[in-house]
């Protein structure tokens, strides 16, 4: 808390300008009017105030707006945003994408802080859903943003927003998240032709069911091994050797290097050895010839 002291003669600030940068804490407190500060917030960001000085300016705004800052002030906070706590931000009502962008720009280079997470949460809740422009903005600043959301939160993403998603935005998504995103992507890209569709859907295939993988295998897509290794194990297991061969195309040779890793390992265990041998890759571990495979899960379902 800054002690209340009278402003020295001639030091009263008539505007927010560079003459304030060497004001001491108590001088800023005494000589800068909070209402003046609020109307000239855009100037604060052009002046290299120290952290100590920013603390004083924040204190003045807090006194002026105890219920939370208006958006006209929030939009121009600049580096002062770094001084805000999640509790401060929960009092705000941020509706403009421009305001969001301005504050994310200030935080650029930082990890997603609790302040930023709170700001985004307030903004998205206010909008009711993650629309394309918002998602575009958020993933531009934080490529991992999408994967930080819970499956429940992802369910509010409209399919139209999926067009904003880049492959790197999905790098840290787990299967539960891709399970939610894949159907949205399928819907979003449904009017594209085969090869273009595959390019767009590829990053989302970690959420694809068996029947969609079977359909892709009929389209000469030549899936790379990195994508194949991210597929759901339960979706890969029912695929036949012929289907996997068609799905991977020339990349099928890469299965040998991955034969000890899921889902390839588990898939091999489900295939007949003589079918695996047709690939000529030396894959071992399939079901020996003459053995009968009983699918107990299917039996249980029938009974």
């Amino acid at each position: 808390e800054v002690e209340k002291t009278a402003c020295p003669s001639g030091k009263k600030a008539r505007e927010i300008d560079e003459s304030l940068i060497f004001y001491k804490k108590w001088e800023l407190e005494a000589c800068v009017d909070a209402a003046l500060l609020a109307t000239q917030m855009d100037r604060v960001n052009a002046i290299p105030f120290t952290y100590e000085q920013l603390d004083v300016l924040k204190h003045k705004l807090d006194e002026l707006y105890p219920q939370g800052y208006p958006e006209s002030v929030i939009q121009h906070l600049g580096y002062l945003f770094l001084k805000m706590s999640p509790e401060d931000i929960r009092k705000w009502n941020v509706t403009s994408l421009e305001t969001l962008k301005a504050l994310l720009e200030v935080n650029k280079g930082h990890e997603m802080s609790p302040q930023v997470a709170t700001l985004i949460d307030r903004f998205v809740k206010g909008r009711g859903q993650l629309d394309k422009d918002t998602l575009d903005t958020l993933t531009a600043f934080y490529p991992g943003y999408l994967c930080s959301l819970s499956p429940e939160e992802l369910s509010s993403v409209p399919p139209s927003s999926i067009w904003a998603v880049r492959p790197q935005d999905l790098d840290t998504c787990d299967p539960r998240q891709l399970d939610v995103l894949y159907p949205k992507a399928r819907l979003a890209f449904q009017n594209m032709n085969g090869s273009e569709y595959f390019v767009k859907i590829q990053s989302f295939l970690g959420g694809a069911p068996t029947e969609d993988l079977k359909a892709l295998s009929q389209q000469n897509v030549s899936m790379d091994l990195a994508t194949f290794m991210k597929l759901r194990t339960d979706a890969v297991l029912p695929l036949t050797v012929a289907e996997v061969q068609k799905l991977l195309g020339p990349h099928v040779e890469g299965l040998k290097a991955e034969e000890r890793h899921r889902p390839v390992r588990d898939w091999i265990l489900r295939q007949r050895q003589d079918d695996l041998d047709t690939l000529g890759l030396g894959l071992q571990g399939g079901i020996p010839n003459g053995y009968l495979v009983l699918d107990l899960s299917m039996q249980e379902a029938l009974s």
């Epitope: 560079e18 003459s19 940068i21 060497f22 960001n45 052009a46 002046i47 290299p48 105030f49 120290t50 952290y51 100590e52 000085q53 603390d55 600049g78 580096y79 770094l82 930082h110």
Partner: antibody, heavy 118, light 106 residues
């Protein structure tokens, strides 16, 4: 890309004067606060002087106050340091640096050596 | 505000994990930057706000700390990392630097 090039350094006798210049390019010079920072041989860094973007607000370290004058010409993208009444302890490499909004020194020149000796 | 760096010098080998500390004479929040200076060259900004990596700086450099105690860590020292490192506070004017830590080849 951003470039800061200092000039004007050299050998001067105690009590003498020198004028350092810093030519800036690759960024909007008039938007930036600029600093002079010096480094005595084998020693650390000392913030010597600071000038606001318009040139109206200036700072000097106590060690140079009254002897050094910082100025800028935004039309010429240039920063200056007029050094008078030089002392042996002013011997150093002098760097000009752009000062970010966070008060860090973002871009530096290569430095110019000032030697004060009789 | 005075900044005290320790150690003033250290010897290390390529691949070593190196830690340099900077202590402020009073609390400075996270208003601390780290610079690298190679012989005959100007300093280069590595880290600002105590832990944020400047654009283009390798991820083996990291910063931590808040208040009075700060650390610069190089996770796996590379040949080009042998240099002198300085901390700088920007919590209040005048802006000040630490005395430097020289990282030499063992």
């Amino acid at each position: 890309q951003v470039q800061l090039v200092e000039s004007g350094g050299g050998l001067v006798k105690p009590g003498g004067s020198l004028r350092l210049s810093c030519a800036a390019s690759g960024f909007t010079f008039s938007d930036y606060y600029m600093s002079w920072i010096r480094q005595a041989p084998g020693k650390g860094l000392e913030w010597v002087s600071y000038i606001s973007s318009s040139g109206s607000t200036i700072y000097y370290a106590d060690s140079v106050k009254g002897r050094f004058t910082i100025s800028r010409d935004n039309a010429k993208n240039s920063l200056y340091l007029q050094m008078n009444s030089l002392r042996a302890e002013d011997t150093a490499v002098y760097y000009c640096a752009s000062t970010s909004r966070r008060c860090t020194f973002q871009h530096w020149g290569q430095g110019t050596l000032v030697t004060v000796s009789s | 505000i005075q900044l005290t760096q320790s150690p003033s010098s250290l010897s290390a080998s390529v691949g070593d994990r190196v830690t340099i500390t900077c202590r402020a004479s009073q609390g400075i929040s996270s208003a601390l930057a780290w610079y690298q200076q190679k012989p005959g060259k100007a300093p280069k900004l590595l880290i600002y706000d105590a832990s944020s990596l400047e654009s283009g700086v390798p991820s083996r450099f990291s910063g931590s700390g808040s208040g009075t105690d700060f650390t610069l860590t190089i996770s796996s020292l590379q040949p080009e990392d042998f240099a002198t490192y300085y901390c700088q506070q920007f919590n209040s004017y005048p802006l000040t630097f630490g005395g430097g830590t020289k990282v030499e080849i063992k």
